[in-house]
């Protein structure tokens, strides 16, 4: 079954997908589409890369990570409820039936009603995230800094977010781990 990822309306959704290229200039074509991965290519394509470039993308979709190192994780900006559904990341490895296909389920939740931001701070400023890719990801640690990909913005809601959003499980299941601090 597909791994589930969550985001709130108005935030950015992050859908992880990785592979290990032979070299930064020797990449594998990748496509992202909305809907289950079909027999070939991607349906309702929203982004596509080739051996060197990101050669197709639509307005709210972009690659959060360094695709030259195989991080083809998709960011969807300013999500709405209509963005909910299954997304396909297809790594188009040369050869017959060699493609790697990942179906990821995105669940969009209505935006939380929050009180006036008296003590609100950017979560990432206080707790820089270290996303360490493992397994099929590039063998390095990347400090992601204050980026709007995981959508945790208030320190006061950190515990609830980690529990409710299944963030830790999501990242673990996708071959990545998250460390706070």
């Amino acid at each position: 079954s597909e791994v589930e990822y969550r985001a709130e309306v108005g935030q950015n959704a992050y859908l992880p997908c990785f592979y290990t290229p032979a070299a930064p200039g020797n990449l594998v074509p990748v496509c992202w589409g909305k809907g289950f991965c079909p027999w070939s290519q991607c349906t309702n394509e929203v982004l596509r890369t080739d051996e060197r470039d990101v050669n197709y993308w639509t307005s709210r979709y972009w690659l959060n990570g360094d695709f030259r190192k195989g991080d083809v994780s998709l960011t969807i900006e300013n999500v709405t409820l209509a963005d909910s559904g299954i997304y396909c990341c297809r790594i188009q490895i040369p050869g017959i039936m060699n493609d790697e296909k990942f179906n990821l389920k995105l669940v969009i939740k209505p935006a939380k009603v929050t009180p006036a931001p008296t003590r609100q701070r950017d979560f990432t400023a206080a707790f820089p995230r270290m996303l360490t890719t493992r397994g099929h990801g590039p063998a390095e640690t990347q400090t992601l800094g204050s980026l709007p990909d995981i959508n945790l913005t208030q320190i006061s809601t950190l515990a609830n977010e980690l529990r409710d959003s299944r963030l830790a499980n999501d990242l673990r299941d996708s071959g990545a781990t998250i460390r706070i601090g």
Partner: antibody
């Protein structure tokens, strides 16, 4: 209009570390898609790509310099930096920062004016 | 890494003449070749990318052609401001590499 501006000391002693900073203005620095590069040009010679940093912090270096190069970024200041250790006279060059986009990888569409760094005791 | 060889090293022409600059790659780079112009004391400026596409704001007198290992930058009618050094650069193989340059000077 995107503008890049290099800054740093113009003179570095042999065996020391060269440090330069590039400040980016008028563009979307903390946004996916853009790669921030360092390229150098020894006096009277051609250009050599040194390395890049992506806004996520991911880096990639020219194998010929990899053991001595570190590129980092400070998104709060719209800056990225180059450190080149154990310099010799062969590292004397004009150092440029430049940008490329993932829709045309390694095609450098915006450059800084360059800063000359001389390695001498 | 791929070596790019530019010729001639220096080209002496007069305004109004046609300039033809050559860049040869040590192995095929398909069409992944760019041309840059550099004037004294200035940064390189992107002219042509992917062998034949003019960058934004580049005059139509600049054109690029070629594929594989042999490429040409043509300036159809030289203007005084075109006298500079021109570099080719490949992005087919990593790392990206540059040619040594052709100096276009006033005859």
């Amino acid at each position: 209009q995107v503008q890049l501006q290099e800054s740093g000391p113009g003179l570095v002693k042999p065996s020391e570390t060269l440090s330069l900073t590039c400040t980016v203005s008028g563009g979307s620095f903390s946004r996916g898609g853009y790669y921030w590069n360092w390229i150098r040009q020894p006096p009277g010679k051609g250009l050599e790509w040194i390395g890049y940093i992506y806004y996520s912090g991911s880096t990639n270096y020219n194998p010929s310099l990899k053991s001595r190069v570190t590129i980092s970024l400070d998104t709060s200041k719209n800056q990225f930096s180059l450190k080149l250790s154990s310099v010799t006279a062969a590292d004397t060059a004009v150092y440029y920062c430049a940008r490329d986009h993932y829709s045309s990888s390694w095609t450098f569409d915006y450059w800084g004016q360059g800063t000359l760094v001389t390695v001498s005791s | 890494e791929i070596v790019l060889t530019q010729s001639p090293a220096t080209l002496s022409l007069s305004p109004g003449e046609r300039a033809t600059l050559s860049c040869r790659a040590s192995q095929s780079v398909s069409s992944y070749l760019a041309w840059y112009q550099q004037k004294p004391g200035q940064a390189p400026r992107l002219l042509i990318y992917d062998a034949s596409n003019r960058a934004t704001g580049i005059p139509a007198r600049f054109s690029g052609s070629g594929s594989g290992t042999d490429f040409t930058l043509t300036i159809s009618s030289l203007e005084p401001e075109d006298f500079a050094v021109y570099y080719c650069q490949q992005r087919s193989n990593w790392p990206p590499t540059f040619g040594q340059g052709t100096k276009l000077e006033i005859k």
